[in-house]
């Protein structure tokens, strides 16, 4: 997260760290007791590594009573996701068992109504991604409030030049932005999950290259079918 601040500890009980061989790889969001939603591209280079999900965490390194690392029983990338596009960049991870819920571990309601969030709406994005252009990784969860950007502006040639489909949304990126390591994390508007940080190699913090988020409402049928 660029230009953000440390989050209040455990105030986002839906927040997950998707880990590869014990190290933070991507963000994720608990959407059901046994399911975490993240980004498909996160597992592209995972190969034979061990993928796990950390729930109930604020610090990645310090012991916390609510922290627990779960093995992954099943990883379900969206069937249409491809390495070279930002489209359909969603991944559902089934935990080895139902998460132990409590004040610091709680699923987040996700948007099912397929309607665009109004431009200018302030949404919260959180993650353990890099916090500066030098690539410094934080130990504690960071967050930032970002205004939603209308799709037409996001599709301008100087922005994302037509790449933003109706299944994607954008948020402003003027110094405050999601960045590398935040992919798969939640964009939350009005207490509801609206988007998932896409995991492309986008430049961060440049206002002409807005953050791109996969609209979960557009994938409600797929999410429901996997969780069923």
């Amino acid at each position: 997260i660029l230009g953000g601040r440390e989050a209040e500890a455990h105030a986002r009980p839906y927040m997950a760290s998707v880990q590869l061989n014990g190290a933070h790889l991507c963000g994720g969001v608990l959407v059901a007791e046994q399911w975490v939603l993240s980004a498909a591209h996160c597992l592209e280079d995972a190969a034979d590594g061990k993928v796990q999900v950390l729930l109930g965490a604020h610090s990645l390194s310090q012991p916390e009573p609510s922290k627990r690392l779960y093995d992954v029983l099943r990883a379900v990338p969206h069937p249409d996701s491809q390495p070279d596009t930002i489209d359909h960049d969603l991944l559902l991870l089934q935990l080895s068992e139902k998460a132990t819920l409590g004040p610091a571990v709680r699923p987040l309601p996700w948007q099912r109504v397929d309607r665009d969030v109004a431009p200018g709406t302030l949404c919260d994005v959180a993650g353990w991604g890099i916090v500066n252009h030098a690539g410094r990784r934080p130990d504690s969860l960071q967050h930032v409030l970002l205004p939603v950007l209308d799709r037409a502006t996001c599709n301008r040639r100087t922005h994302h030049d037509g790449a933003i489909t109706e299944r994607l949304m954008c948020a402003e990126s003027n110094r405050r932005d999601s960045c590398k390591g935040d992919s798969g994390g939640p964009l939350v508007c009005g207490g509801v999950l609206e988007g998932v940080v896409t995991s492309g190699s986008r430049v961060c913090g440049n206002r002409k290259k807005p953050g791109i988020y996969t609209r979960v409402a557009s994938y409600a049928a797929w999410i429901d079918s996997v969780l069923a």
Partner: antibody
């Protein structure tokens, strides 16, 4: 298939007005800026300006700002170009073109002739 | 406003020839985001322009590989490696980095 269809061109007297339409289909109208470009007979391409179909924000080439106005009817997926105080040098083919990717999609153009 | 000057204004060539068109801008067209929005369009009589090249050197989908773009800063080039009968047309460079966006005056490629 993305389609842009202009209409409303024709013969108009100097000092007169005309409203051109650009009807879009094959995509979500509010997802892309619409631009207007004109081409005088035997001449090059000249950008008039653009409009954001979500916010209605506009940007005009300074040469056209006082006499030309953009508007929208999103329910009809249509952009409009209102041209006032027309002069002989406004005689041209007028195109609408969607921005994103680049100017990949253009209408067929509509000819406006300003003559007495 | 940024002026784009194309040269030559017209040229005569034969099928199979290698054709080069240059476009010079009055100032740099590197955008504040670091990209250069220099595009090339082909237009045939009575038709709307067609996008060939975007961001200096990227061919738009469906554009034959004989078309290529290059350049940086203020000097840009469109090259047709082996001219085909359907390539006889007028070519325009365009800059989208700075408002107002502008077109070059065009280069007409005619049959020799």
């Amino acid at each position: 298939e993305v389609q842009l269809v202009e209409s409303g061109g024709g013969l108009v007297q100097p000092g007169g007005s005309l409203r051109l339409s650009c009807a879009a289909s094959g995509y979500v109208f509010t997802s892309y800026y619409m631009n207007w470009v004109r081409q005088a007979p035997g001449k090059g391409l000249e950008w008039i300006g653009d409009i954001n179909p979500v916010t209605g924000d506009t940007d005009y080439n300074a040469d056209f700002k006082r006499r030309f106005t953009f508007s929208l009817d999103t329910s009809k997926s249509t952009a409009y170009l209102q041209m006032n105080s027309l002069r002989a040098e406004d005689t041209a083919v007028y195109y609408c073109t969607r921005e994103g990717p680049s100017f990949a999609y253009w209408g067929q153009g509509t000819l406006v002739t300003v003559s007495s | 406003d940024i002026q784009l000057t194309q040269s030559p204004s017209s040229l005569s060539a034969s099928v199979g020839d290698r054709v080069t068109i240059t476009c010079r801008s009055s100032q740099t067209i590197v955008h504040s985001n670091g990209d250069t929005y220099l595009e090339w369009y082909q237009q045939k009589p009575g038709k709307a322009p067609n996008l060939l090249i975007y961001k200096v050197s990227n061919r738009f989908s469906g554009v034959p590989s004989r078309f290529s773009g290059s350049g940086s800063g203020t000097d840009f080039t469109l090259t047709i490696s082996s001219l085909q009968p359907e390539d006889f047309a007028t070519y325009y460079c365009f800059q989208g980095s700075h408002v107002p966006v502008t077109f070059g005056q065009g280069t007409k490629v005619e049959i020799k």
